[in-house]
Interface confidence: medium
């Protein structure tokens, strides 16, 4: 008789999860010479140890500490790009502007990007059928706790001017419940961070509104100002042109507003 298994509301662990994490670790350490010392076997063991045999609604940041320690990485603290609900453009940007970094450009972010994982209490099995959904099941699930942990550490490391890319097409351009709004904003260190500069990305070709005046952006400005950090905001009216101008800043069309 098959053993009873908890049914969660979210999708199960990504297929070939161990292989994917290990292959990504190898690839990352090959591409980034400064991370060549990393032992990917130990990284996988620490990753696995964070959630295997544990109840997937009872995961803590403490569970991920061995992994955090192994994945310790120094990125230039003044070259950090945060993002909310606009991951693809943020990643396209850092692929071109190679000296800036999103969380997914770091080892730990790269390992887990777009993956889902969870285990089962008291068994060494990975659950490929279902995993807890943040809203419908529980917030202390392996994936949510991982991203909360790495996002907090990433924000804590930032200094000088920190940039954040926000999606101007969404009803809430700044969402207090996003990882950026609930974790990163509150973990920027006022002693180190002088300014948070928001880049609001417009979706429509003909959208000429000043989205920096949006009520949610004003809310972000208020939160940031109360934390003793300056705030600035820019509209990116033409994201395609914006990327093009990052690639070719000498282009004559790049002197006008983008």
């Amino acid at each position: 008789v098959p053993r009873w298994r908890q049914q969660w509301s979210g999708p199960g662990t990504t297929k070939r999860f161990p292989e994917t994490v290990l292959a990504r670790c190898v690839k990352y350490t090959e591409i980034h010479p400064e991370m060549r010392h990393v032992d990917c076997q130990s990284v996988w063991d620490a990753f696995k140890g964070a959630f295997i045999s544990k109840h997937p609604c009872n995961i803590t940041e403490e569970d991920y500490q061995p992994l955090m320690k192994l994945g310790t990485q120094t990125v230039p603290c003044n070259k950090i790009l945060l993002w909310s609900r606009i991951k693809d453009l943020a990643h396209q940007f850092t692929q071109v502007q190679r000296d800036m970094f999103t969380l997914e450009d770091t080892l730990l972010g790269y390992l887990a990007d777009d993956l889902t994982w969870c285990g089962e209490f008291n068994t060494s099995k990975i659950n490929y059928q279902s995993c807890p959904d943040w809203r419908k099941d529980c917030s202390n699930n392996p994936v949510s706790v991982f991203w909360k942990t790495v996002s907090r550490r990433f924000a804590e490391a930032a200094c000088d001017v920190v940039h954040v890319m926000l999606n101007g097409s969404r009803s809430k351009i700044f969402d207090k419940n996003s990882t950026f709004g609930s974790v990163e904003v509150h973990n920027l260190q006022p002693e180190k961070v002088q300014t948070l500069e928001a880049w609001v990305i417009h979706g429509g070709r003909e959208d000429s509104r000043d989205l920096c005046q949006d009520p949610t952006i004003k809310e972000l400005e208020s939160i940031i100002s109360k934390r003793n950090i300056q705030f600035s905001c820019k509209n990116i009216y033409r994201p395609d042109k914006f990327l093009q101008c990052v690639k070719n800043p000498e282009d004559s069309s790049c002197t006008s507003e983008i």
Epitope: E19, P33, R36, H37, C40
Partner: antibody, heavy 120, light 107 residues
Framework: QVQLVQSGAEVKKPGSSVKVSCKAS????????ISWVRQAPGQGLEWMGR????????NYAQKFQGRVTITADESTSTAYMELSSLRSEDTAVYYC?????????????WGQGTLVTVSS | EIVMTQSPATLSVSPGERATLSCRAS??????LAWYQQKPGQAPRLLIY???TRATGIPARFSGSGSGTEFTLTISSLQSEDFAVYYC?????????FGQGTKVEIK
């Protein structure tokens, strides 16, 4: 005990191709990176390229680009190195090697080598 | 491509003596350097990785040092089984490249 066992010696004509196999035992094959290194008689070691079996990702030295194909078959835990358009200078011992702890940079475990002789 | 240059090409040493082998990279490879030992008719054997970390089972008489472009492999007291060819290899940049080797022979 992890081992890499390679196929036997080959004698080939110039212009033909050779495919050398490397079977892994005693470890989780798919997540270890397999590199190929060759050594001409009396000469030094030359890195040719590598494969990550779980993804099929490859990387080749420029010198061999277009002539070498490195593949892996997870079902049989075997990696392959195929070299085409053979010339006499390709006469060498070909080694497969594996990194320590999933890593490909330093090569901790080596196959016994396969001698490929190219002669008309 | 990073060129690795080893010196000397041949080193004649008496058993019990110290041997010092050098390896120079044409550009910085940080600490991403390995050393191998190869005996005739055998596959290479990993001695050192990360410029200074001894591989599993390698005797303490083998030590590596250096970073950037200059590296050294030291064998503190040569045993008869240490007479072989030694290669350095960088894994900082594609393609990984080896030095041409240093032959350590009995004086």
């Amino acid at each position: 005990q992890v081992q890499l066992v390679q196929s036997g010696a080959e004698v080939k004509k110039p212009g033909s191709s050779v495919k050398v196999s490397c079977k892994a035992s005693g470890g989780e094959f798919s997540i270890y990176v397999i590199s190929w290194v060759r050594q001409a008689p009396g000469q030094g070691l030359e890195w040719m390229g590598r494969v990550i079996p779980s993804t099929g990702d490859t990387n080749y030295a420029q010198k061999f680009q277009g002539r070498v194909t490195i593949t892996a078959d997870e079902s049989t835990s075997t990696a392959y190195m195929e070299l085409s358009s053979l010339r006499s200078e390709d006469t060498a011992v070909y080694y497969c090697a594996r990194g320590k702890a999933y890593y490909s940079g330093w090569l901790a475990i080596w196959g016994q080598g396969t001698l490929v002789t190219v002669s008309s | 491509e990073i060129v690795m240059t080893q010196s000397p090409a041949t080193l004649s040493v008496s058993p019990g003596e110290r041997a010092t082998l050098s390896c120079r990279a044409s550009q910085s490879v940080s600490s991403n350097l390995a050393w191998y030992q190869q005996k005739p008719g055998q596959a290479p054997r990993l001695l050192i990785y990360g410029a200074s970390t001894r591989a599993t089972g390698i005797p303490a008489r083998f030590s590596g040092s250096g970073s950037g472009t200059e590296f050294t492999l030291t064998i503190s007291s040569l045993q008869s089984e240490d007479f072989a060819v030694y290669y350095c290899q960088q894994y900082n940049n594609w393609p990984w490249t080896f030095g041409q080797g240093t032959k350590v022979e009995i004086k």
